[in-house]
C-alpha cells in the first residue's frame, strides 16, 4: 500500500531533493530555502534563485523549507520549573530542560514539569535519577517506600498499602510500591 501523501508532499515529490514545485507553475522546480531562512518569493523561472530571507529575531527554521513565515521560538515554562538550556537561534529552537538533580514528568508529549530527584534518605539509591525518571530507592529496615521517599513504619496504619512492607517479623524491608496503586 502506498501511504497517502498530502498535496504539499505530492508537489514536492515531483521535484528533485532540495527543490519544490512552483505553486503557480508546476513545470518549475524552485530551490528550497536553507535552514535559518524562509521563503519570501518563489523563483521566477527554471534555474533562477528563490528569494529567501533570514528569520527575524524570535523566530527560526530548523531545516530546508519553503515556509512563508519562520516558526516562533518556544519559551521555557517557568511555572513548570523549566530552565533554558540553549537560546533560540535562526536555525534552532530554544532548548528547555530541568535544573541539576531534577527530572522531567511529561503531562503531554511536549509539555514537561520539573520535579526534584529523591535523595533516598533512610534508604539506598537503587537506580540513579535520570532525565525522565526519578531515583529508585530501596528503603532500610523499619521504613517503607511512599511516592519514592522512605518513610518510617511508625507512620504506617493498619490496612494501608504499607502494612505488608512493615511486618515486624520481616527484618530487611525492601521498599516496593504496592502493585495495586500504580
Amino acid at each position: 500500500l502506498v501511504p497517502h501523501l498530502g498535496d504539499r508532499e505530492k508537489r514536492d515529490s515531483v521535484c528533485p531533493q532540495g527543490k519544490y514545485i512552483h505553486p503557480q507553475n508546476n513545470s518549475i522546480c524552485c530551490t528550497k530555502c536553507h535552514k535559518g531562512t524562509y521563503l519570501y518569493n518563489d523563483c521566477p523561472g527554471p534555474g533562477q534563485d528563490t528569494d529567501c530571507r533570514e528569520c527575524e529575531s524570535g523566530s527560526f527554521t530548523a531545516s530546508e523549507n519553503h515556509l512563508r513565515h519562520c516558526l516562533s521560538c518556544s519559551k521555557c515554562r517557568k511555572e513548570m520549573g523549566q530552565v533554558e538550556i540553549s537560546s533560540c537561534t535562526v536555525d534552532r529552537d530554544t532548548v528547555c530542560g530541568c535544573r541539576k538533580n531534577q527530572y522531567r514528568h511529561y503531562w503531554s508529549e511536549n509539555l514537561f514539569q520539573c520535579f526534584n530527584c529523591s535523595l533516598c534518605l533512610n534508604g539506598t539509591v537503587h537506580l540513579s535519577c535520570q532525565e525522565k525518571q526519578n531515583t529508585v530507592c530501596t528503603c532500610h529496615a523499619g521504613f517503607f517506600l511512599r511516592e519514592n521517599e522512605c518513610v518510617s513504619c511508625s507512620n504506617c496504619k493498619k490496612s494501608l498499602e504499607c502494612t505488608k512492607l512493615c511486618l515486624p517479623q520481616i527484618e530487611n524491608v525492601k521498599g516496593t510500591e504496592d502493585s495495586g496503586t500504580t
Epitope: Y106, W107, K132, E147, L160, C162, G180, T181, T182
Partner: nanobody, 120 residues
Framework: EVQLLESGGGLVQPGGSLRLSCAAS????????MGWVRQAPGKGLEWVSA????????YYADSVKGRFTISRDNSKNTLYLQMNSLRAEDAAVYYC?????????????RGQGTLVTVSS
C-alpha cells in the same frame, strides 16, 4: 484494592458549569498526586489537571487554564474538578487518576469515568 469512583458528569450548555467528584478508597489518598484525565470521542487520553498530595502544587492543561479548578479534601478522600465556562471541545469522558510521576505521559491507575456532554 484501589477504587476511584467519579460522579458529577452530565449534559450542560456551552458556558455552563459542572463539578466533578472522585471518591477514592484502598489507598492512602493524601500521599499521592491525583488528577483528572479526559478522553474525547475518537481522541487519545489527555491530562486536564492534577494536584499534589498536600494540595500545594497543581497542574492545568493550557486549554482549561482559568476555567477549571482542581481541589482535594484529604479528610474525605475526595478529589474535585470545578469546570466553568464549558466549551464544546470539553465534552469527553473524565477519569479520576493517580499520577505516577516520571517519564510519561502516563495515565496511572484510573476510575471508570463520568461523561461530560456540552451541547446547546
Amino acid at each position: 484494592e484501589v477504587q476511584l469512583l467519579e460522579s458529577g458528569g452530565g449534559l450542560v450548555q456551552p458556558g455552563g458549569s459542572l463539578r466533578l467528584s472522585c471518591a477514592a478508597s484502598g489507598l492512602t489518598f493524601e500521599w499521592y498526586w491525583m488528577g483528572w484525565v479526559r478522553q474525547a470521542p475518537g481522541k487519545g487520553l489527555e491530562w486536564v489537571s492534577a494536584v499534589s498530595g498536600s494540595g500545594g502544587s497543581t497542574y492545568y492543561a493550557d486549554s482549561v487554564k482559568g476555567r477549571f479548578t482542581i481541589s482535594r479534601d484529604n479528610s474525605k478522600n475526595t478529589l474535585y474538578l470545578q469546570m466553568n465556562s464549558l466549551r464544546a471541545e470539553d465534552a469527553a469522558v473524565y477519569y479520576c487518576a493517580k499520577v505516577k510521576l516520571g517519564g510519561g505521559p502516563n495515565f496511572g491507575y484510573r476510575g471508570q469515568g463520568t461523561l461530560v456532554t456540552v451541547s446547546s
